[in-house]
């Protein structure tokens, strides 16, 4: 699928935007008419919603934050602008919750459905004489089977809730009016304290910081992060070393082991957080292949770890090479998708920052149009790529990356050799049959892993429904550090990939990171899209969100434009 | 390119039993919920049923519960709708359907006349 619309953004099927005529297909055009379809408010015909439908029953729901239909009956809704629907009641005798498909157009119980487009049914009291009244509507699949009375941005008043917000909003100007002078002090204080920490790395002046153009700069680090931006892309040279005083081992890898450290300043107060990769004497070469990657100014990113000087110093345990780089108190992707679930929003924005690190890496300019040397990371996986504070990521370890410079002959490539993680080796990788004419091909690898990172992000993401327990790709198929030959079983023999289980394709958003995702692990690397294409569709799914106006943390669709019709 | 493909139409009597098949391919099945979906001459499109990706959950419109059942083989990429106790108003084209975000992935369709 998708195959001739490779580099492009969503291939038509995908992109909601289309006219009726040229969504349905033209042998059923012939016999319907326009009247009978119906679509969205962009044009795409709609499938029908699957609601529970149960008409009225008696209820033991009383008096709880959310209960269950216990409803047996999902129904296809006969008409697709039909949203799913419950009803509870009580009154002096009885309890009862009514599920149905209604047509939001049309009121319900002398109601209009306000929360029509809601993924969930969240319950608002309406006016009834003699009985209490609860009603929500909702458009995901079997929706109306958990309803919900209680949720923290729901009110049964919004009335109050406007006024809340006016009478708030003008008690608020005088303190918002000092906290902004606050910030603006703090501001100078900050850009001050930055200057004196430049001074600090400069010793004497000797070294000259690199600059960007004066077109471009632009600041591309964690928002939170303290590292002075001037400070990147540094080595440092000079005799006298950066006053960094280790903290605690926060990671270890194949060939080093990373601390969170304080970088002091002039007063011994004073101290930046930043993260030091220590490598041994024994692993030079990886630190040095690690040092010149990061040593090109034109990689800085906002999405790529923000680079500040390389050392060589001497303990007591023989001679280290250091990589001082900015902290991310969030730790790696891994550990942060085993720690928490994520919703459809963090999802999107992990994703996205993803794939533009990974097109940065890759392209041959950067953002502003200057040349930049291509750059294949070559270990691509979840525990290879930081969480910032903003959670979005930013990928680290360079240590098997390849500069693809054009003078590189076919020989100098291969002997670069099958290097990676085998969990995450594309399927050419592990069969060492790369295509060693076209760099391209090494771009397509770091493609196939990052699908597998994509598939990771979404089977926490709680838009899906039921989250399971963290697992990396092929978890249950593969012992927790495979060899490259069971991965050949998985992945060439059976032509195995992780699991998309199909409740996840209920939500508009995933299935169309599904999409993407399948397409990135393609067999056939060729067919593969690439990082760039993936950020745009990323850019492209954030923007039909906002056009939708809907709140998409936890969007579900009937699930897709459907087509039903009147009978 | 997606391609789906309808067998199994034909006459039968009333009362009478047919089964239709589904042949796709051009994608990942298993991913994908899949449907049945028909047109009576000269009406609407009327969705018949649905079925998950892995076949666990299946679905019916009021008209057929009780007399239809989907199913389908992810491991020949087939999607099927047995079709029992049949009646002059099933009769129609039925096409199948990969659920997607638009309308484009649609069989030719089979047609199904019930008559005696």
């Known amino acids: 699928m998708g195959r001739g619309l490779l580099r492009g953004l969503w291939p038509l099927h995908i992109v909601l935007w289309t006219r009726i005529a040229s969504t349905i297909p033209p042998h059923v055009q012939k016999s319907v008419n326009n009247d009978m379809i119906v679509t969205d408010n962009n044009g795409a015909v709609k499938f029908p919603q699957l609601c529970k439908f149960c008409d009225v029953r008696f209820s033991t729901c009383d008096n709880q934050k959310s209960c269950m239909s216990n409803c047996s009956i999902t129904s296809i809704c006969e008409k697709p602008q039909e949203v799913c629907v419950a009803v509870w009641r009580k009154n002096d005798e009885n309890i009862t919750l009514e599920t149905v498909c209604h047509d939001p157009k049309l009121p319900y119980h002398d109601f209009i459905l306000e929360d029509a487009a809601s993924p969930k049914c969240i319950m608002k009291e309406k006016k009834k004489p003699g009985e209490t009244f609860f009603m929500c509507s909702c458009s995901s699949d079997e929706c109306n089977d958990n309803i919900i009375f209680s949720e923290e941005y729901n009110t049964s008043n919004p009335d109050l809730l406007l006024v809340i917000f006016q009478v708030t909003g003008i008690s608020l100007l005088p303190p918002l009016g000092v906290a902004i002078s606050v910030i603006i002090i703090f501001y100078c204080y900050r850009v001050n304290r930055q200057q004196k920490l430049s001074s600090t790395w400069e010793t004497g002046k000797t070294r000259k910081l690199m600059e960007f153009s004066e077109h471009c700069a632009i600041i591309l680090e964690d928002d939170r992060s303290d590292i002075s931006s001037t400070c990147a892309n540094n080595i440092n040279h000079n005799t006298e070393l950066l006053p960094i005083e280790l903290d605690t081992l926060v990671g270890k890898g194949r060939f080093a082991e990373v601390y969170k450290a304080k970088l002091k300043q002039n007063t011994s107060e004073q101290f930046e957080t930043v993260a030091v990769k220590i490598f041994p004497y024994e692993e030079y070469a990886s630190w040095k292949t690690e040092k010149d990657i990061f040593s090109d100014i034109n990689l800085k990113h906002e999405n790529i770890l923000q680079f500040l000087t390389a050392e060589e110093r001497k303990t007591e345990l023989g001679k280290q090479y250091w990589l001082i780089t900015a902290f991310h108190a969030k730790g790696n992707l891994q550990e942060y998708l085993t720690r928490h679930v994520i919703s459809w929003e963090d999802l999107r924005k992990l994703g996205s920052s993803l794939a533009r690190g990974i097109a940065h890496l890759h392209s041959d300019h950067t953002p502003c149009g200057r040349p930049k040397m291509p750059i294949v990371h070559r270990d691509l996986k979840s525990s290879n790529i930081l969480v910032k504070n903003d959670l979005t990521c930013c990928l680290c370890d360079f240590g098997l990356s390849l500069r693809l410079d054009p003078t590189l002959s076919v020989d100098d490539l291969a002997n670069s050799g099958q290097v990676g993680t085998a969990r995450y080796m594309a399927p050419e990788v592990l069969e060492s049959r790369m295509n060693l004419e076209n760099v391209e091909s090494f771009k397509q690898t770091d493609v196939y892993s990052m699908a597998l990172v994509l598939w990771e992000m979404t089977s926490r993401c709680n838009a899906v429904g039921e989250v399971k327990d963290y697992e990396p790709p092929f978890g249950s198929k593969v012992r927790e550090h495979p060899c490259v030959e069971s991965m050949k079983d998985n992945v060439l023999r059976d032509r195995g990939r992780p699991e998309i289980p199909s409740f996840w394709l209920n939500h508009q958003g995933i299935q169309m990171v599904c999409e993407t995702l399948t397409e990135c692990w393609d067999h056939d690397p060729e067919a593969r899209l690439t990082a760039q294409c993936v950020a745009e569709r990323f850019s492209e799914l954030e923007h039909l969100d906002r056009l939708s106006g809907r709140s998409c943390s936890e969007e579900k669709i009937p699930e897709d434009g459907s087509l039903n019709t009147t009978k | 390119e997606v391609q789906l493909l309808e067998s199994g139409g034909g006459l039968v009597q009333p009362g009478g039993s047919l089964r239709l098949s589904c042949a796709a391919s051009?994608?990942?099945?298993?991913?994908?919920r899949m449907w049945w979906v028909r047109q009576a001459p000269g009406k609407g499109l009327e969705w018949v049923s649905?079925?998950?990706?892995?076949?666990?959950?299946?679905y019916y419109a009021d008209s057929v519960k009780g007399r239809f059942t989907i199913s389908r083989d992810n491991s020949k990429n087939t999607l099927y709708l047995q079709m029992n106790s049949l009646r002059a108003e099933d009769t129609a084209v039925y096409y199948c359907?990969?659920?997607?975000?638009?309308?484009?992935?649609w069989g030719q369709g089979t047609l199904v006349t019930v008559s005696s």
């Open positions: 649905a079925i998950s990706g892995s076949g666990d959950k299946t």
């Open positions: 051009g994608f990942t099945f298993v991913n994908y």
């Open positions: 359907a990969k659920h997607g975000l638009s309308f484009d992935y």
